[in-house]
């Protein structure tokens, strides 16, 4: 048993049939000695007496908000949380596998750039009783500084008979040192709790195996004269690093046809411009990736031929 | 009608065992809050332990570790497996349907002596 905050503990107990539980003893936190007695949550059945109680704890039916009294008053309550562990596994219900990029990948987590700004998101298909808490270090044996902020609802989707939640959370290293070269890991913690249950779930990254950057911004195209070429150009997202000159991206630049299954004509190109061939009801789009090294490429910035 | 009968008190030395039985009847213990209490002599009740319906135990501190309450549903009996008894352990011990002890037995003597 630890505790999670402030009269809230959480019991680690071996889940399977017939498991004997845990014994776990609470104290009233109270100066009184004598005619102290507890109840567990709205029950008016008297549980125990004394300032110490030894509770067998075993099941969901044994957590909850235990509560000591005397004389009618209530002198001091502990929340039980309870953490499952299966086979040597913590259960992971709460949670959605997102399966991307692997298995058993419940938090995911991107960066724009390389200020030490991110954000994680999760999914879930509970949309009650639900509470999380956020916790992030660099390095976990000497944590350096990691802020974040409360997680927060960011959408809903149905899936089939089901609907989806999406949470995220926003996250800043105390003291990034954009180029500086990564040696030790962000760690990002998730407690979640659904009504008495309890779980964790962790991330370890390097900033610069999350980096997404924002799609190019300002495209245009330029209608070269007597040809069917166009000249596309763009701009750095606001949001990448700076100078460009050291946080420099690369581009890919794509014609699509109308019809998906027409073929794509695709170009590289370090420099913020390119010349093509629009053709009739194509669009161009563009995307950005570190050029340095290769994490993820951002979303296509579009804008139709015509 | 409802009834429990306490058994298996008697007289050990310090440090020994004994196991307690309450035969219940008129109601089925596996769906019932059950209680043992004992009363030391010129003492009021003290509570001892606690089994819920889902078989989840309570116990007094004074008691931790060494007395263990568990139940045979299809005996219909409560137990009270008393191990490492000292003398301060010495009372008239019930099984009970209630905290406060109103619903009990008769009560089994126990007591602990060299």
């Known amino acids: 048993i630890w505790e999670l905050k402030k009269d809230v503990y959480v019991v680690e107990l071996d889940w399977y049939p017939d498991a004997p539980g845990e014994m776990v003893v609470l104290t009233c936190d109270t100066p009184e000695e004598d005619g102290i007695t507890w109840t567990l949550d709205q029950s008016s059945e008297v549980l125990g007496s004394g300032k110490t109680l030894t509770i067998q704890v075993k099941e969901f039916g044994d957590a909850g908000q235990y509560t000591c009294h005397k004389g009618g008053e209530v002198l001091s309550h502990s929340l039980l949380l309870l953490h499952k562990k299966e086979d040597g596994i913590w259960s992971t219900d709460i949670l959605k596998d997102q399966k991307e990029p692997k298995n058993k990948t419940f938090l995911r987590c991107e960066a724009k750039n390389y200020s030490g700004r991110f954000t994680c998101w999760w999914l879930t298909t509970i949309s009650t009783d639900l509470t999380f808490s956020v916790k992030s270090s660099r390095g976990s044996s000497d944590p350096q500084g990691v802020t974040c902020g409360a997680a927060t609802l960011s959408a809903e989707r149905v899936r089939g008979d089901n609907k989806e939640y999406e949470y995220s959370v926003e996250c800043q290293e105390d003291s990034a040192c954009p180029a500086a070269e990564e040696s030790l890991p962000i760690e990002v913690m998730v407690d979640a709790v659904h009504k008495l249950k309890y779980e964790n779930y962790t991330s370890s990254f390097f900033i610069r195996d999350i980096i997404k950057p924002d799609p190019p911004k300002n495209l245009q195209l330029k209608p070269l004269k007597n040809s069917r070429q166009v000249e596309v150009s763009w701009e750095y997202p606001d949001t990448w690093s700076t100078p460009h000159s050291y946080f420099s991206l690369t581009f890919c630049v794509q014609v699509q046809g109308k019809s998906k299954r027409e073929k794509k004509d695709r170009v590289f190109t370090d420099k913020t411009s390119a010349t093509v061939i629009c053709r009739k009801n194509a669009s161009i789009s563009v995307r950005a990736q570190d050029r340095y090294y290769s994490s993820s490429w951002s979303e296509w910035a579009s804008v139709p031929c015509s | 009608e409802v009834q429990l009968v306490e058994s298996g008190g008697g007289l050990v030395q310090p440090g020994g065992s004994l196991r307690l039985s309450c035969a219940a009847s008129g109601f089925t213990l596996s769906g019932s809050w059950m209680y043992w209490v004992r009363q030391a002599p010129g003492k009021g009740l003290e509570w001892v332990s606690t089994i819920k319906p889902n078989g989840s135990t309570a116990s007094a501190d004074s008691v931790k570790g060494r007395f263990t309450i568990s139940r045979d549903n299809a005996k219909n009996t409560l137990y009270l497996q008393m191990n490492s008894l000292k003398p301060e352990d010495t009372a008239l011990y019930y099984c009970?349907?209630?905290?406060?002890?109103?619903?009990r037995g008769q009560g089994t003597q126990v007591t602990v002596s060299s």
């Open positions: 009970a349907r209630d905290f406060s002890g109103n619903q």
